[in-house]
């Protein structure tokens, strides 16, 4: 968001105010409420970042990260048996993507047509709500999966009904949570009409009394609690992970989780410093800037930020794939492009073939699919 | 060199019109907005509105329903008509060229054209 | 709609003298306050931009300074030609014009 600066009495992603309708004259428009954007901020929403990079990002975004989302939720709901907790915030953290991701092709012909939305004003409402709902859903998420990791390590006790009973409790609380810290961006006015430019914006230039003080107060807020305090616990449970990692056993099938568990870390701190680190950081210096200047100097990185951030719907179905035993037996052969039942099929043939030639016994992989603690 | 030069004076009657034209040389229309303002005899400068390179028009409160900006891209010259006039509208009007972003000026201004409204 | 108010209406001094010419605005503008001087008969023509920037041809004895709501243009060593009428106009919310500081030969 940018600071728009409004025309008329008082009044970002440039400083603006709510602005009134608009009525066409002769070949242009004679609005009643004008914004108007400065020279850097203009050249950034016409230039080749916002209307070729983002678009071809956002593109591989929803590629990826429909497809292996939704196979995703579809595993965890339909094809796992044991519900475990892994199992219900991975499901919730599936969720979350998807419903952000689905919107991505407004996003993209919002960004290749010039930033210019023309899908209205709700549509713009919901977009930014569900993506900055899932940049905070997929925090908490990640912060619950990575708390539960560890607490298997050290209490190795068996699945209880009782504790997919608390992660689903956990699980709408964050759903609740993110709903109420999400609804000033659904509340507040997201388009913007930019004379100069000729374009409608949807989230990019914000109103100047809201962003002056209240987004500014509203990112910092989130930055530091739905961010930093759920980073805190993440990187707290991956240390005392490895801890434990490294003093438990060492067996040849504790070291193919050991291994597993350190790719997992790998591809949260990957999560975090590619998705989740630039975004808050660069949400809260841009509206600081704004606040104190009247313009943002970081926007172009800020854009840039926000932008990598929607990574987390790609990066996430590695996470399904290094904690789930389901994900990864559904993974592989989804890319094969074979069933998992034709997969079966043949284990079971093999073992029959195996056992008729041999009198030996010969246990075929379980049919019942496993998630791995 | 950048110009702006604008029609002559005008006499006019109370309810009448008036269209004054700003001609622009060094640069073109389409890439400067041109904003109008007004300085009534021994008082300040008053911002009236402003036409952007690609057509858009925006005009002050006050001015709101009375006034329209136009331009001619072929002719390089930017209009302002001021309808229903009154005693009080008796000013020297100028035109100034402004790039139409918010850290720009108004660089270079018209030499003005008084507007006298008289029964 | 924020209001500019310049201080004082007239400033009587002589030529070589510094002049100090005030602009308050009734709320935070940042940086987005130009400077224009006006000569009777003439229009407007822009001395400083965005607070403090000279523009063309602008003699360095005109500086501007100031952030936010309160805003000063100096004029170090007053020359003949400088005797005029100095607005400025804010820009970052709506344009308005200051009402004017007249210059005048003491």
């Known amino acids: 968001t940018i600071q728009g600066t409004n025309r008329s009495s008082k009044g970002r992603s440039l400083i603006g105010k709510v602005d009134g309708t608009s009525h066409v004259t002769g070949k242009g428009v004679t609005v009643e409420t004008v914004f108007s954007v400065d020279e850097f901020s203009a050249s950034v929403l016409t230039g080749k970042l916002t209307t070729v990079f983002l678009p071809i990002v956002y593109t591989i975004v929803f590629v990826v990260g429909l497809p292996s989302n939704g196979m995703a939720l579809w595993v965890f709901l339909f094809r796992t048996k044991k519900k475990h907790p892994a199992v219900i915030y991975m499901a919730n953290l599936a969720l979350a993507d998807l419903l952000s991701v689905i919107w991505f092709p407004l996003k993209i012909a919002y960004h290749i047509h010039g930033n210019n939305w023309i899908y209205g004003e709700a549509l713009c409402n919901v977009l930014i709500g569900f993506f900055y709902g899932n940049m905070y859903c997929s925090i908490l998420f990640m912060t619950c999966l990575s708390v539960q990791r560890y607490w298997v390590i050290v209490n190795p006790m068996g699945h209880s009904r009782k504790k997919a009973n608390i992660a689903i409790g956990i699980s709408l609380a964050i759903w609740l949570l993110i709903l109420l810290v999400t609804i000033p961006l659904y509340v507040v006015k997201q388009t913007i009409f930019i004379p100069a430019l000729n374009i409608t914006t949807c989230h990019d230039v914000l109103p100047e009394q809201l962003l002056v003080g209240d987004m500014f107060n509203y990112f910092l807020s989130l930055a530091i609690g739905v961010f930093l305090f759920p980073a805190f616990l993440t990187a707290s449970a991956y240390v005392l992970m490895i801890r434990m990692l490294r003093s438990s056993a060492m067996d040849e099938n504790s070291e193919k989780k050991r291994k597993r568990a350190i790719k997992l870390i790998v591809t949260v701190l990957a999560m975090y410093l590619i998705c989740f680190t630039p975004s808050n950081l660069l949400l809260v210096v841009h509206y600081f800037l704004i606040k104190s200047q009247g313009q943002s100097h970081v926007y172009a990185l800020y854009i840039v930020a926000l932008c990598l951030s929607t990574l987390n719907s790609c990066i996430d179905p590695f996470v399904y794939y290094f904690v789930s035993h389901d994900f990864r037996d559904h993974a592989k052969n989804a890319l094969l492009c074979r069933s998992v039942r034709t997969v079966k099929q043949m284990q079971v043939s093999l073992t029959s073939k195996k056992h008729s030639r041999k009198s030996s016994s010969y246990s075929s992989s379980s049919t019942t699919v496993k998630t791995s603690y | 060199q950048v110009q702006l030069v604008q029609s002559g004076a005008e006499v006019k009657k109370p309810g009448s019109s008036v269209k004054v034209s700003c001609k622009a040389s060094?640069?073109?229309?389409?890439?400067?907005?041109v904003i109008w303002v007004r300085q009534a005899p021994g008082q300040g400068l008053e911002w009236m509105g402003v036409i952007w390179g690609n057509g858009n028009t925006y005009y002050a409160q006050k001015f709101q329903g009375r006034v329209t900006i136009t331009a001619d891209e072929s002719t390089s010259t930017a209009y302002m008509e001021l309808s229903s006039l009154r005693s009080e509208d008796t000013a020297v009007y100028y035109c100034?060229?402004?790039?139409?972003?918010?850290?720009?000026?108004?660089?270079?201004w018209g030499q003005g054209t008084l507007v006298t409204v008289s029964s | 709609e924020i209001v500019l108010t310049q201080s004082p209406a007239t400033l009587s001094l002589s030529p070589g003298e510094r002049a100090t010419l005030s602009c308050k605005a009734s709320?935070?503008?940042?940086?987005?306050l130009d400077w224009y001087q006006q000569k009777p008969g003439q229009a407007p023509r822009l001395l400083i931009y965005?607070?403090?920037s000279r523009a063309t041809g602008i003699p360095a004895r005109f500086s501007g300074s100031g952030s936010g709501r309160d805003f000063t243009l100096t004029i170090s060593s007053l020359e003949p030609e400088d005797f005029a009428v100095y607005y400025c106009?804010?820009?970052?919310?709506?344009?308005?014009f200051g009402g004017g500081t007249k210059v005048e030969i003491k």
């Open positions: 060094g640069f073109s229309l389409s890439s400067y907005g």
């Open positions: 106009l804010q820009h970052n919310s709506g344009w308005t």
């Open positions: 709320q935070n503008i940042y940086k987005y």
């Open positions: 965005n607070t403090n």
């Open positions: 100034a060229r402004w790039r139409g972003y918010k850290d720009y000026p108004f660089d270079y």
